[in-house]
Amino acid sequence: YSNFRKSVDSTGRRQYQVQNGPCSYTFLLPETDSCRSSSSPYMSNAVQRDAPLDYDDSVQRLQVLENILENNTQWLMKLENYIQDNMKKEMVEIQQNVVQNQTAVMIEIGTSLLNQTAAQTRKLTDVEAQVLNQTTRLELQLLQHSISTNKLEKQILDQTSEINKLQNKNSFLEQKVLDMEGKHSEQLQSMKEQKDELQVLVSKQSSVIDELEKKLVTATVNNSLLQKQQHDLMETVNSLLTMMSSPNSKSSVAIRKEEQTTFRDCAEIFKSGLTTSGIYTLTFPNSTEEIKAYCDMDVGGGGWTVIQHREDGSVDFQRTWKEYKEGFGSPLGEYWLGNEFVSQLTGQHRYVLKIQLKDWEGNEAHSLYDHFYLAGEESNYRIHLTGLTGTAGKISSISQPGSDFSTKDSDNDKCICKCSQMLSGGWWFDACGPSNLNGQYYPQKQNTNKFNGIKWYYWKGSGYSLKATTMMIRPADF
C-alpha cells in the first residue's frame, strides 16, 4: 500500500513524503525564496541594471551570488545522483509492485520534480547570466581603473622626475646666487671702501689745489708787487742820484699814491705793475662782487682779460643761460668768464676784442674788433662789433649786425630751429651763423664735416672744428 503526502517542515521548507509499504521516502526540495525578489537590485528574469557605484559592495554581492550558485549546483548534482542511484531501483520496484494510481502519483511527483528542476535551472541560468554580466562589467571597470591608474602613476612619476630636476636646478641656482651675493657684497664693500678712500683723497686734493691756487695768486701778486716796488725803488734811486748830482736842485718830498687793491680788468692790473700772466681777482664795476679771471700779460703788449678759452675739451660748454651769465670752468684751463661781468665792464668804457685761433695743422690766426660791447641781460646780451682786422678772415664770422645770445634753455636766435641745441653751446647765433666758438670739442682727425664743432667759417671754412680758441678784451685806450 502506498500513499503520497505534501507537508512543510519546521524551517518552512516544503517536503514530499512517499509511503510504500514498510519504506517511507522523503524529498526535501530547495525553496525559490532563497532567490532575491524582483524588488531587489538584481531582478530575476529582468534586464541587468548598471553596476552600483560602490565597488566593495558589488564585490560582496558577487560573492553572495557565487555562494548561492555553488550551493544550487551542488544540490542539483546530489539530486541527480540520488535520482540516478535510487530512483531507478525504486521505480522498477514500484512498476512491478504498485497499481496504476501509484504510477500516476509517481509521475506527478516526477513531473513536479522536473518542473521544479527546470524552474530552478532557469533561475540559475538567469543568476549565472547576471553574475557573468556583472563580472564582465566589473572586469571592464577594473581594466579601465587599471589603465587610468597606470596613466596617473606614469604622470606622477614624470612629474616627480621633473620636480626633482627643478629642485636640483633650483638648489644649484640658489647656491650660485648665494655665491654671487657673497662675492657681490664683498665687491660692494671693497668698492665702498675704495670710494670712501677716493673721496677722502679728492677732498684732500681739492683743498690742496685750493691752497695752491691761493698761494699762486698770492705769489703772483707778491711777485708783481715786488717787481713794482723794485721799479719804484730804482726810479727813486735814480732820482736821488740825479738830485745829488745837480747841486742847485731843490730837495723834494715824493708823495706816493695809496696802493690800488681792487681792479676792474687785467689792464689795470698790468698798469699797476703786475705784468705776469696768470689768475687775478677782478671786481665788478660799482660793486664789491669779485670774479677770478685769467690775465694775458704777454700777447700784443699785455693787459688782456680773457673772457673765453678752449683747448682740450675738458669742460662741457653745453650750459644753461644762468651758467653763461655767471661763468663756468677754470681760468687755468677752459672757461667762460660770464656774460654779466663782461656786459657791465664793456658798458662803461670802450673795449677791443681779440680772438685767437689755432687749427690742427699748427696754424694760428686772429680777428681783432676795434669796438666790442655786450648789451644787458634785458637785451639777451646782444653783441656789438665794429672795425674788423686780422688774419682769420676779411669777413666777420660773428654775424653782423650783432645777434642775441642763446643757450640750450633760452632760444633767442633767428632760425626756425634752435641753434644752441642743434649746434651745441651758448653763442650769438644768427640762423645759425658762420661761427660758434663754444661748440662741441672734437679731437684731431675727427674734426671735419662737423655740424656742431668749434667753428670760425671765414678762416677754416664749414665743418672744421678748431683745436684752440681764446677771446680776450682790453680797453681801447690801453
Partner: nanobody
C-alpha cells in the same frame, strides 16, 4: 661720421651733358638739404643748386636755370645733378655739401654757404671743344 662722395665729372664738349652723383653716408636725406657748389680756378666758390628732400623744394642759380636739374633718391641716399647744354664757363670743380634742413632763417628759403658744414672732395667738370 658724415661723408659725401661726388662722381660723374669729366671732359665734355659744349652743348653736351653730364650727370653728377653725390652719395651721402652718416646722414639721412630726409633731415638734410644737399647743395651743389662749384669753384672755378681763381674764383670764389658759388652755389649752383640745392634740394630739400623732405619738402621736395629745389633751388637753382640764375646762371643754370633751365639747363640743370637736381633730384634725389632717398632709398639710395644719393642726390643727382643733371647738367645739359653745358658751356665752357661751367668748367669748375663741383662739390656737394649738406646742411641740417631746419637751419633756416625765418622768412628765407635757402641757406648761406657757411651753413653747409659737410663737404665732399669734389669732381672736376671740363667743358671744352
Amino acid at each position: 661720421e658724415v661723408q659725401l662722395v661726388e662722381s660723374g665729372g669729366g671732359l665734355v664738349q659744349p652743348g653736351g651733358s653730364l650727370r653728377l652723383s653725390c652719395a651721402a653716408s652718416g646722414i639721412t636725406l630726409d633731415d638734410y638739404a644737399i647743395g651743389w657748389f662749384r669753384q672755378a680756378p681763381g674764383k670764389e666758390r658759388e652755389g649752383v643748386s640745392a634740394i630739400r628732400s623732405s619738402g621736395g623744394s629745389t633751388y637753382y642759380a640764375d646762371s643754370v636755370k633751365g639747363r640743370f636739374t637736381i633730384s634725389s633718391d632717398n632709398s639710395k641716399n644719393t642726390v643727382y645733378l643733371q647738367m645739359n647744354s653745358l658751356r665752357p664757363e661751367d668748367t669748375a670743380v663741383y662739390y656737394c655739401a649738406a646742411v641740417p634742413a631746419g637751419r633756416l632763417r625765418y622768412g628765407e628759403q635757402w641757406y648761406p654757404i657757411y651753413e653747409y658744414d659737410a663737404w665732399g672732395q669734389g669732381t672736376l667738370v671740363t667743358v671744352s671743344s
